[in-house]
């Protein structure tokens, strides 16, 4: 957890208490389950990893959002509601990070195994961009944040 959190951000705390992040959790869980069903294997091959290599140092611009994907009626409804909730955090990157960390923590017990946990984290990292929002900088979604062994 970051230092700013220890200092206490009352405005963020009240925002988090007001927010209903359940649709985000539902959307992400449905997405990873749907991907597992579709592929019958790990859908996140290295070529789909958000940290995959590129020769352009400015390639993954956190502020060039993509419009959100509406595949899957139930999931798109959850996604729309999720994006509306996350939109409340747009002007507070720290708070956006807190919200995403909260989603991760809320779902961590429901994720089965390391592979599903990694898939959930990858989808969670993509969520702000899918919603047309800025992805936070300096935001650790993992209690034990791990990168790839080779990079």
């Amino acid at each position: 957890r970051q230092q700013w959190e220890l200092q206490g951000d009352r405005r963020c705390q009240s925002q988090l208490e007001r927010a209903n992040l359940r649709p985000c959790e539902q959307h992400l869980m449905q997405k990873i389950q749907r991907d597992e069903d579709s592929y019958g294997r790990d859908p996140y091959s290295p070529s789909q990893d958000p940290y995959s290599p590129s020769q352009d140092p400015d390639r993954r611009d956190p502020y060039s959002p993509s419009p959100y994907d509406r595949r899957g009626a139930g999931s798109s409804q959850h996604q729309e509601r999720c994006c509306n909730e996350l939109n409340e955090f747009e002007n507070n990157q720290r708070c956006m990070c807190e919200a995403l960390q909260q989603i991760m923590e809320n779902q961590s017990d429901r994720l089965q195994g390391r592979q599903q946990e990694q898939q959930f984290k990858r989808e969670l990292r993509n969520l702000p961009q899918q919603c047309g929002l800025r992805a936070p900088q300096r935001c650790d979604l993992e209690v034990e944040s791990g990168g790839r062994d080779r990079y």
């Epitope: 957890r1 970051q2 230092q3 700013w4 940290y51 290599p53 590129s54 020769q55 352009d56 140092p57 400015d58 390639r59 993954r60 956190p62 502020y63 002007n91 507070n92 990157q93 720290r94 990292r125 800025r134 992805a135 936070p136 900088q137 300096r138 935001c139 650790d140 979604l141 993992e142 034990e144 944040s145 791990g146 990168g147 790839r148 062994d149 990079y151």
Partner: antibody
Framework: QVQLVQSGPDVRKPGATVKVSCQTS????????MNWVRQAPGQGLEWIGL????????AYAQKFQGRVTMTSDTSDSTVYLELSGLTPDDTAVYYC??????????????WGQGSLVTVSS | SYVLTQPPSMSVAPGTTASIPCGAN??????VHWYRQKPGQAPVVVVS???DRSSVIPDRFSGSKSGDTATLTISRVEAGDEGDYYC???????????FGGGTKVTVL
């Protein structure tokens, strides 16, 4: 392309305050955090702190707490580093460096040319 | 606070492989980035745990991590690879950026 242009060299007496500027261009100023890193002669890189120009939030290295102030001016896309209570040990090249990455990925692709600050009586 | 430890210097023969270590507690769990600095110049990122490598850097540069050590590997070393190399991480516990002490690489 991204450009970070820093102010020129400065000489200060011990106990004084110095203010270094870093004017940016080639990207949306409020979208990326700016960091300050210094390098004393013959020494390694030392992180001083960062500022988020969008929110004004700052994070300073423990060592500099209490005598460093980072500010930004969105009207001309410039960030400033102010260091007070200078001692000869603060003699160094001061760099501004723009952040890159999201979430736990955080590093610097774009750097200023450096500003030499000399503290001498 | 989180500390990154690098050997102060190393010498390498041209055409061989150089491995520059960066040690820290459980560093394999961190995102590690590497910079090269030449005299009188600002540092340049050579390998990052984000995009593999920056566009101006040859693919002879690569990074790896295991346990308490991150390693920058330069294959087929050339005279132009001389410089000071620094590892860097962002430490989420303190919300601080941390640099290693640097390794001066000399090509024999």
């Amino acid at each position: 392309q991204v450009q970070l242009v820093q102010s020129g060299p400065d000489v200060r007496k011990p106990g004084a305050t110095v203010k270094v500027s870093c004017q940016t261009s080639g990207y949306r100023f409020t979208d990326y955090e700016m960091n300050w890193v210094r390098q004393a002669p013959g020494q390694g890189l030392e992180w001083i702190g960062l500022i988020n120009p969008h929110s004004g939030d700052t994070a300073y290295a423990q060592k500099f707490q209490g005598r460093v102030t980072m500010t930004s001016d969105t009207s001309d896309s410039t960030v400033y580093l102010e260091l007070s209570g200078l001692t000869p040990d603060d003699t160094a090249v001061y760099y501004c460096a723009r952040s890159q990455g999201t979430f736990e990925v955080y590093y610097f692709v774009s750097w200023g040319q450096g500003s030499l600050v000399t503290v001498s009586s | 606070s989180y500390v990154l430890t690098q050997p102060p210097s190393m010498s390498v023969a041209p055409g061989t492989t150089a491995s520059i270590p960066c040690g820290a507690n459980n560093i394999a769990k961190k995102r590690v980035h590497w910079y090269r600095q030449k005299p009188g110049q600002a540092p340049v990122v050579v390998v990052s745990d984000d995009e593999d490598r920056s566009s101006v850097i040859p693919d002879r540069f690569s990074g790896s991590k295991s346990g308490d050590t991150a390693t920058l590997t330069i294959s087929r070393v050339e005279a132009g690879d001389e410089g000071d190399y620094y590892c860097q991480v962002w430490d989420s516990k303190t919300d601080h950026v941390v640099f290693g002490g640097g390794t001066k690489v000399t090509v024999l």
